[in-house]
């Protein structure tokens, strides 16, 4: 229904805690170099503007749409042009483009220092003396470092902080209690963080049909009792929501997720046993709680899939009479049977089928050519069962650093060009799908390690995009995004690459790496890695271990040593003439 | 919503000829291979022929072999059969089906063979 003033209806919904939050998000990841204050500022005079309006739609101005309330406010800060150069541009054009334009300036990798948690001491005291300015802190600086971050979900999250800093802060020993926790809630939001941008990703390159697709099979996994026409609907509402998040429409993104939530619940009878625990709970953490939850038990009586997609002679005329619609049909099918399969994979199955259909179809005699499309698909999902397995395998014999440090390796001879930091970034977050799949139950595996992959992955395309340096990865990045993850498993080392010149100072290290947090001195450590594989791109992998080997333990000699410094200076070149010889 | 329309049936002697059309609609027809299917009073669907999308590819029932000549002019979205030698045994009602369908969705046309 059509409201008067659409900021009075989205204020009236949402509550003034919840629409603050998302109005500070959405500016935030807009102009993600503004101060908090900057930005807490315009979040207060929109504000008061609400709730002007919520006392009177017709008040002026009222009726103007979202992106114009906003995009008059970003448009209206001091020295924009200065502070974001070409960004200032968009303010010269009208909506809907000036949104468009905004959305396209978001940077994925902005030039920010990594977000630092405060010593716990003075994190509790912050809280305590204002729980409100700290939590929009945490908004602020996760958004801003993070563009197309779920928006309900960071809420989700900033709540999740709020407890932890509740419960902790009033504990004797604060540091024990806020470390564990506060890592958790980091760990769950970065991956929530590159799950949601890869479906931004999807919606923004292959719209919305490409999105609803992936949100069909996910669903179908996830609610096999639910008939297609259920599936249908929220996989429909589902996609909605998304593409609001994922162009900036915040307070239509968070509305109408909190609806389907509500839908949900009170459609618990033809959707899923499993939905009540989740529905129990207050708004954020129900509709947290509904997006990740268990699969319902698969009906005991589903008939085989070739019985309606194989051998049923209508099947042309089926896929003649509504493509999608039979498509679909199969996606559905085909993925309530199997929880066991990634989302790529089903994707990828659908994908083959569809092509069969294309070409079978056109022929004579259509049955005896589509009557083999199963046993087709066996390839096709023997690949990623190979790919978890022998992962899983190197996982566990070499632990979470070292099985990075295999990925490391193999990535950089797969694409040398690329930058060592992105590489060692994508490494880091492509090994921790150890650590997150691997331990899980067999049936568990793939579903969690390909998507997961498949995430991090789309990661890897969008810092290449910004500086495109290698062809490899523009072949991988340039297909559709279900047919990356085998793309990239399936490069081997770039031959047109010609090693770097080796350096002495790259491998040069002093003592303050002693002082260094475990995790940044493994990034040092991979960082050495991967110039090493630049300059030998062919090195074994006993040649690499040798060096790895030998310059962990000068690190741990010197670091131990009375005089560091001497040791270093002194130890230093011989390890680098150690490891030029080990490569030779 | 697909539309399958024959025509050009009656009633005609035996080693008489006839020629069927199917007009199609409502779905891209050249993309599709397309059958003749007939049925006799009292009996099941049996298959008569079929062609390719593009018209490159035919297959005939042995029982119509080099009696009956199965065409298509996509620019028309049209699929025919043209029978000549007809037989007793011919009297049925065909139909036009998509892909390798045994099942009518339309409502046929009936030829008679008889003198």
């Known amino acids: 229904e059509a409201h008067k003033s659409e900021i009075a209806h989205r204020y009236n919904d949402l509550g003034e805690q919840h629409f603050k939050g998302l109005v500070l998000i959405a500016f935030s990841q807009y102009l993600q170099k503004c101060s908090y204050d900057e930005h807490a500022k315009l979040v207060q005079e929109v504000t008061d503007f609400a709730k002007t309006c919520v006392a009177d739609e017709s008040a002026a101005n009222c009726d103007k749409s979202l992106h114009t309330l906003f995009g008059d406010k970003l448009c209206a800060i001091p020295n924009l042009r200065e502070n974001y150069g070409e960004l200032a541009d968009c303010c010269t054009k009208q909506e809907p483009e000036r949104n468009e334009c905004f959305l396209q300036h978001k940077d994925d990798n902005p030039s920010l220092p990594p977000f630092e948690r405060p010593e716990a001491e003075a994190m509790c005291t912050s809280f305590k003396e204002n729980p409100t300015t700290f939590m929009g802190h945490y908004l602020h600086e996760v958004a801003r470092r993070h563009p197309y971050f779920y928006a309900p979900e960071l809420l989700y999250y900033a709540e999740q902080y709020n407890e932890i800093l509740t419960q902790c802060c009033a504990e004797a020993d604060k540091e024990s209690c806020l470390t564990p926790k506060l890592d958790g809630v980091k760990e769950k939001a970065l991956v929530s963080s590159v799950r949601q941008r890869m479906k931004c990703s999807s919606m923004q390159k292959f719209g919305e049909r490409a999105f609803k697709a992936w949100a069909v099979a996910r669903l179908s996994q996830t609610f096999p009792n639910a008939d297609f026409a259920e599936i249908t609907k929220l996989a429909t509402d589902l996609t909605k929501v998304n593409k609001e998040c994922c162009h900036g429409d915040l307070l239509e993104c968070a509305d109408d997720r909190a609806e389907l939530a509500k839908y949900m619940c009170e459609n618990q009878a033809t959707i899923s046993s499993k939905l009540q625990t989740c529905c129990d709970k207050p708004l954020l953490k129900k509709a947290h709680c509904l997006s990740e939850v268990e699969h319902d038990t698969m009906p005991a009586d589903l008939p085989a899939i070739a019985a309606d997609f194989v051998e049923d002679q209508e099947v042309c005329k089926n896929y003649a009479e509504a493509k999608d619609v039979f498509l679909g049909t199969f996606l559905y099918e085909y993925s309530r049977r199997h929880p066991d399969y990634s989302v790529s994979l089903l994707l990828r199955l659908a994908k083959k089928y569809e092509a069969t259909l294309e070409k079978c179809c056109a022929e004579a005699n259509p049955p005896a050519c589509y009557g083999t499309v199963l046993a087709e698909f066996q390839p096709l999902v023997e690949e990623p069962k190979n790919l978890v397995k022998t992962n899983c395998d190197l996982y566990e014999k070499l632990g979470e650093y070292g099985f990075q440090n295999a990925i490391l390796v193999r990535y950089t001879q797969k694409a040398p060009q690329v930058s060592t930091p992105t590489l060692v970034e994508a490494a880091r977050n492509l090994g921790r799908v150890g650590t997150k799949c691997c331990t899980l139950p067999e049936d568990q595996r793939l579903p969690c390690v390909e998507d997961y992959l498949s995430a991090i992955l789309n990661r890897v395309c969008l810092l290449h995009e910004k500086t495109p340096v290698s062809e490899h990865v523009t072949k991988c990045c340039s297909g559709s995004l279900v047919e990356r993850r085998p793309c990239f498993s399936a490069l081997t080392v770039d031959e047109t690459y010609v090693p770097k010149e080796f350096k002495a100072e790259t491998f040069t290290f002093h003592s303050d790496i002693c002082t260094l947090p475990e995790k940044e001195k493994q990034i040092k450590k991979q960082t050495a890695l991967a110039e090493l594989v630049k300059h030998k791109p062919k090195a074994t992998a006993e040649q690499l271990k040798t060096v790895m080997d030998d310059f962990a333990q000068f690190l741990d000699t010197c670091c131990k040593a009375a005089d560091k410094d001497t040791c270093f200076s002194t130890e230093g070149p011989n390890l680098v003439t150690r490891c030029k010889d080990a490569l030779a | 919503k697909v539309q399958l329309v024959e025509s050009g049936g009656g009633l005609v002697q035996p080693g008489g000829s006839l020629r069927l059309s199917c007009a199609a609609s409502?779905?891209?027809?050249?993309?599709?291979?397309m059958s003749w299917v007939r049925q006799a009073p009292g009996k099941g669907p049996e298959w008569v022929s079929s062609?390719?999308?593009?018209?490159?590819?035919?297959l005939y029932a042995d029982s119509v072999k080099g009696r009956f000549t199965i065409s298509r002019d996509n620019s028309k979205n049209t699929l025919y059969l043209q029978m000549n030698s007809l037989r007793a045994e011919d009297t049925a009602v065909y139909y036009c089906t998509i892909g390798g369908s045994l099942r009518a969705s339309s409502q046929g046309t009936l030829v008679t063979v008889s003198s």
């Open positions: 062609i390719s999308g593009s018209g490159s590819d035919t």
């Open positions: 409502g779905f891209t027809f050249s993309s599709f291979g």
